[in-house]
């Protein structure tokens, strides 16, 4: 899978994580920080 950094317009896309652009899948993906989940790492869990 080809990946790259997200475009600058997606800077705020991932609330608590790193935004990765999955080129072959034509979509952005959030790699969440520890303790966070959700498509955009918007949910905190203990």
């Amino acid at each position: 899978v080809s990946i790259t950094k997200c475009n600058s317009d997606m800077n705020g896309y991932c609330l608590h994580g790193q935004c990765i652009y999955l080129v072959d899948m034509s979509q952005n993906y959030c790699r969440c920080e520890v303790g966070y989940t959700g498509v955009r790492c918007e949910h905190f869990y203990l």
């Epitope: 475009n7 600058s8 317009d9 705020g12 652009y21 080129v23 979509q27 952005n28 498509v39 918007e42």
Partner: antibody, heavy 116, light 106 residues
Framework: QDQLVQSGAEVKKPGASVKVSCKAS????????IQWVRQAPGQGLEWMGR????????KYREKFEGRVTITADTSTNTAYMELSSLRSEDTAVYYC?????????WGQGTLVTVSS | DIQMTQSPSSLSASVGDRVTITCKAS??????IAWYQQKPGQAPRLLIQ???TLQPGVPSRFSGSGSGTDYTFTISSLQPEDIATYYC????????FGGGTKVEIK
């Protein structure tokens, strides 16, 4: 199956406002950005602006600043684009476009005609 | 706002010809360019994103290349069904479409 279903065609008088809706199904708009693009008859594609429904952040193209308002209602999974002070040059097909989780998934378009 | 200058605005070519369209950005867009095909009365169809990544179901005669500010879209062998208007779109910083290129058969 993911869908963006837009409201029906509108005819408006110059100076009036129009509000076009874009209802998402099959996905949560909070996971995406919703962009708005228009195309006047026989003309090219023109990006108008976008909203991040989760944060409520909006960005508009400079030429529409002050005349366009993009909103989202996450409870109904619907985005809206309101354009005010309509003039004949605003006659166009208006499209909502999903981006973020999937690159550029388009609604079917809404024709807005501005005529006196 | 980033400006996208697309050329030519129209072209006429024969079936089987190689067709090339260019888009120049007013600043580096880091390969974040997409190409759309639009036929009359239809919504635009995404052909290519991230400069050169073909979408599923798009024929391999379509291709894209470029970096920095200069990008190219190519149809290696023009087919009758390719008659349409083609648009580039930068999506690095917000979004800007090129002016479009109308492709006709000679």
């Amino acid at each position: 199956q993911d869908q963006l279903v837009q409201s029906g065609a509108e005819v408006k008088k110059p100076g009036a406002s129009v509000k076009v809706s874009c209802k998402a199904s099959g996905f949560n708009i909070k996971d995406t950005y919703i962009q708005w693009v228009r195309q006047a008859p026989g003309q090219g594609l023109e990006w108008m602006g976008r909203i991040d429904p989760l944060r409520g952040n909006r960005k508009y193209r400079e030429k529409f600043e002050g005349r366009v308002t993009i909103t989202a209602d996450t409870s109904t999974n619907t985005a809206y684009m309101e354009l005010s002070s309509l003039r004949s040059e605003d006659t166009a097909v208006y499209y909502c476009v999903r981006s973020g989780t999937l690159f550029d998934f388009w609604g079917q378009g809404t024709l807005v005609t501005v005529s006196s | 706002d980033i400006q996208m200058t697309q050329s030519p605005s129209s072209l006429s070519a024969s079936v089987g010809d190689r067709v090339t369209i260019t888009c120049k950005a007013s600043q580096d867009i880091h390969k974040y360019i997409a190409w759309y095909q639009q036929k009359p009365g239809q919504a635009p169809r995404l052909l290519i994103q991230y400069t050169s990544t073909l979408q599923p179901g798009v024929p391999s005669r379509f291709s894209g290349s470029g970096s920095g500010t200069d990008y190219t879209f190519t149809i290696s062998s023009l087919q009758p069904e390719d008659i349409a208007t083609y648009y580039c779109l930068q999506y690095d910083n917000l979004r800007t479409f090129g002016g479009g290129t109308k492709v006709e058969i000679k």
